[in-house]
């Protein structure tokens, strides 16, 4: 959930040692306690629709709701992109889209969530039961990926709801190290705000630009009706790959993203999205990885934004998709 | 360093297939991707189309599907194309350019070019 | 597909000049635009990626700018050498595709 919290502008301390430590003490408090707020779980979204026109034509949907910068998402299919997973598509906000047959058409929906048109007939067609998955890496939440499919009974046209996608699994580096940092900023903010407790309260001046009080604004999808789930039956008769579920399967290395540039890229501004809001889903495999970004910030300046690829030594098997994605 | 080295030039009869090979080094195919372009003489550019190593899933413009196949040996880092069903409009220098990932998202290095000449 | 226009076919300068060639994209390819050099009998050498990042070992004379839809390659102090073709190309999207090139010529 995003989550932003509007801090006052402080009055300046008095001068001198203690006027110094006033400031330290107040200021602190308040950058924490904007961690916390602001510490939420991003979520991925997945979202499988039939076409009505063409049974073998599908649209995928995907969205990341969290606050931070996305860098690259990477559709796959036939499970998660580290579990024999297939790369259909390779979005990145600056530097271009890639898809690969049977993906027709990929595009940015919004500054987050991104469309995926597939079509074929034969091998390389998709069918009813088969599983996409989105992986969204961002800074600085990290990777998170989530997977949907059309449910066992449902007409073309009509579409699975989006997924949200909860942690499943996660990597202990982020879980552990982001969670540990905001757990100990939590604990020491209210360390800080009992040893205040008894003293006068600090003089607040409100920020020039938002005159009103301190306030946390929440933002959460709506939980829309949820009666898109039951559809009528439609029989389906393509042939197409197994879905390869496979949540017990780590990646088999880094991921070939691990250093992703530190700028914010201005990410594209698409058209509104489309109507429906992300809203829970039964039977949909989910699955979720949070990577933390360990090289982030080294390359030199004068190399321009870049992404450092990890080939796999393993051969074709191992670098399954294009770009190296497992 | 990166280096590309295509095949010699070809001579080919209307009708004929031609198959052009670039050569990569300083790098392994399965790390970038290989595209392909053509320039007619005096002409612009004309991309052809990408194949992904990694994937072996091939994009083609739309101008050259059924014209040209595009395929990878990953053993010995060669990348082909092939080109069927030949006719004069045909005739042309065909570059192999690396498809860079990492940084530029484009074609960065480039091979020299293949002459094709297709008469009668 | 996007189409990339360069509207100056040629465009003649003199040795120390400043010279501009712009491309305009038919819709928005954010910063995904390249820049290639083609002298007379060679293969294109790459010379900006990503609009405004020079590629290794190009002289700090050649600029790229630009972003969503108007690009533009600045090459200032001009010398002879640069007598070449000039391409953009767009690879926001698949089918990439090049401008229609413009050959600067030296005075």
């Known amino acids: 959930m995003r989550t932003e919290a509007q801090v006052p502008a402080l009055q300046p301390p008095e001068p001198g040692l203690e006027g110094a430590m006033g400031h330290r003490t107040l200021v602190l408090p308040w950058v924490l306690l904007t961690l916390c707020v602001t510490a939420g779980t991003p979520e991925v979204w997945v979202q499988v629709r039939m076409e009505a026109t063409e049974l073998s034509s599908f649209t995928i949907r995907c969205g990341f709701l969290g606050s931070g910068s996305i860098s690259l998402v990477t559709v796959s299919w036939g499970g998660p992109n580290g579990a024999g997973g297939t790369t259909l598509a390779v979005l990145h906000p600056e530097r271009g889209i890639r898809q690969w047959a049977p993906a027709r058409q990929a595009r940015w929906e919004t500054q987050s969530s991104i469309s995926l048109i597939l079509e074929g007939s034969g091998a390389s067609s998709p069918c009813a039961n088969t599983t996409f998955c989105c992986k969204f890496a961002s800074f600085p939440e990290g990777s998170w990926e989530a997977c949907g499919s059309l449910p066992p009974s449902s007409d073309p046209g009509l579409s699975a709801p989006p997924t949200p996608a909860p942690i499943l699994r996660a990597d202990l580096a982020g879980i552990l190290g982001v969670s540990g940092v905001l757990l100990f900023g939590c604990v020491y903010l209210l360390h800080l705000l009992r040893r205040h407790k008894h003293r006068p309260a600090p003089r607040l001046q409100p920020s020039r630009t938002s005159p009103q009080a301190p306030r946390a604004r929440a933002w959460a999808p709506s939980q829309a009706s949820q009666a898109a789930l039951h559809v009528p039956y439609a029989t389906i008769n393509t042939s197409c790959r197994p879905a390869t579920l496979d949540t017990a399967h780590p990646h088999g290395g880094p991921s070939w993203w691990a250093s992703l540039p530190t700028h914010a890229a201005h990410r594209p501004q698409g058209p509104a999205a489309w109507a429906s809001t992300p809203i829970p889903a039964r039977g949909s495999f989910v699955s979720v990885e949070n990577g933390l970004y360990a090289q982030a910030g080294e390359r030199p300046p004068h190399t321009g934004p870049g992404l450092t690829l990890f080939p796999d030594p393993r051969g074709p098997r191992a670098m399954e998709g294009p770009l190296g994605v497992r | 360093q990166v280096q590309l080295q295509q095949s010699g030039p070809e001579l080919a009869r209307p009708g004929a297939s031609v198959k052009l090979s670039c050569k990569a080094s300083g790098y392994t195919l399965t790390s970038h991707g290989i595209s392909w372009v053509k320039q007619r003489t005096g002409q612009g550019l004309e991309w052809i189309g990408e194949?992904?190593?990694?994937?072996?899933?091939?994009y083609y413009s739309e101008k050259f599907k059924g014209k040209a196949t595009l395929t990878a040996d990953k053993s010995s880092n060669i990348a082909y194309m092939q080109l069927s069903s030949l006719t004069s409009e045909d005739s042309a220098v065909y570059f192999c350019?690396?498809?860079?990932?990492?940084?530029?998202?484009?074609?960065?290095?480039w091979g020299q070019g293949t002459s094709v000449t297709v008469s009668s | 597909d996007i189409v990339m226009t360069q509207s100056q076919k040629c465009m003649s300068t003199s040795v120390g000049d400043r010279v501009s060639i712009t491309c305009k994209a038919s819709q928005n390819v954010r910063s995904a635009v390249a820049w290639y050099q083609q002298k007379p009998g060679q293969s294109p050498k790459t010379l900006i990626y990503?609009?405004?990042n020079r590629h290794t070992g190009v002289p700090d004379r050649f600029t790229g700018s630009g972003s969503g839809t108007d690009f533009t390659l600045t090459i200032t102090n001009v010398q002879s050498e640069d007598l070449a073709d000039y391409f953009c190309?767009?690879?926001?999207?698949?089918?990439?595709?090049f401008g229609g090139g413009t050959e600067l010529e030296i005075k």
């Open positions: 350019a690396r498809s860079d990932y990492s940084d530029y998202w484009a074609m960065d290095y």
């Open positions: 190309l767009q690879h926001w999207n698949y089918p990439w595709t």
């Open positions: 990503l609009a405004s």
């Open positions: 194949i992904y190593p990694g994937s072996e899933s091939p």
